[in-house]
Amino acid sequence: GELETSDVVTVVLGQDAKLPCFYRGDSGEQVGQVAWARADAGEGAQELALLHSKYGLHVSPAYEGRVEQPPPPRNPLDGSVLLRNAVQADEGEYECRVSTFPAGSFQARLRLRVLVPPLPSLNPGPALEEGQGLTLAASCTAEGSPAPSVTWDTEVKGTTSSRSFKHSRSAAVTSEFHLVPSRSMNGQPLTCVVSHPGLLQDQRITHILHVSFLAEASVRGLEDQNLWHVGREGAMLKCLSEGQPPPSYNWTRLDGPLPSGVRVDGDTLGFPPLTTEHSGIYVCHVSNEFSSRDSQVTVDVLDPQEDSGKQVDLVSAS
């Protein structure tokens, strides 16, 4: 006769492991008992369980409640056992010793491999600001057994670097994603993808990029110079910019206080019916936590009763 077993049995942490040991004997042969033991190198064999044809299953105190026979129907030549709720410490070499009649004793070894699926974590890097050089956007760490694979899925252009740390029964892998921040990256997803044989599907953690920036400011409203004449109603100046975080707007007049009746509404400066007193240099000040910008315009309100022509100068400054 001969023993049938597996070279390697692989289970995921927490699952039940079937340790196979089947005696394929000639007709009339019987199995008296099957003894299972840990057989790791450097340690004496530690009995796990003994499956006796007459006295039943005996289990070592160290494995009490964790070793069982497979459910019926059972073949008397089958010495397989179930190891419930596999833990990392169960990983290693196992030996089954089968005592048969009249052929004698047989033994076989198998290796139990316990996969420990990773629990990945993603840590964003420092605040991203336009104008920075190559900067850490995020790092992703996953620890498991065997070592997991950590990659990135994104439309954003960047570079990755990985390092791993081996522990006694597992390995931790950390991958970093570096990029040169630009405003076009704002709101873009950066996804860490972790693969592992103990996972049914890849684990994905997504981080949304936030890049601080502030665009140049400009003022709209003076495109048609002929509209800025005494008596005109509804005249307004609008300050244009964009940023992350969204900027705030402030209006001032360079050559004096804002004339009475001029309304500030965020990015918009609203004028009452125009008079020549509204002529002057107006400054839009745009700011967020990242930066600030200024844009100034010169308003000349034309009085049709005067011969002089109207002039408008547009100046932008940062």
Partner: nanobody, 117 residues
Framework: EVQLVESGGGLVQAGGFLRLSCAAS????????MGWYRQAPGKQRELVAG???????RLADSVKGRFTISRDNAKNTVYLQMNSLKPEDTAVYYC???????????WGQGTQVTVSS
Amino acid sequence: EVQLVESGGGLVQAGGFLRLSCAASRSVFRINVMGWYRQAPGKQRELVAGITSGGSRRLADSVKGRFTISRDNAKNTVYLQMNSLKPEDTAVYYCFAEAVVGDEPYWGQGTQVTVSS
């Protein structure tokens, strides 16, 4: 041949405890399986507990959580600690030893355990 000598039986009230001992005439470390059967009047003999040379143990479902089996290699003795005894535990308790796998077991003479309600 292995001689087995039991002791520790007796009369006890329900909820009480007893400790049975089984001393073997040869090293229990080399005995494949040792343990205890019991036989109540008019019933079949049933396996109560067993312990292997490698230290693995078996307890019948009816006694799990109440009985424990242990072995002292230095004294060549196997013990059955019986706690929370019930009237249905009343029986003659026999020590057995299978010296070599497949051989007929050696038996002790039996010790009476009586649990009164």
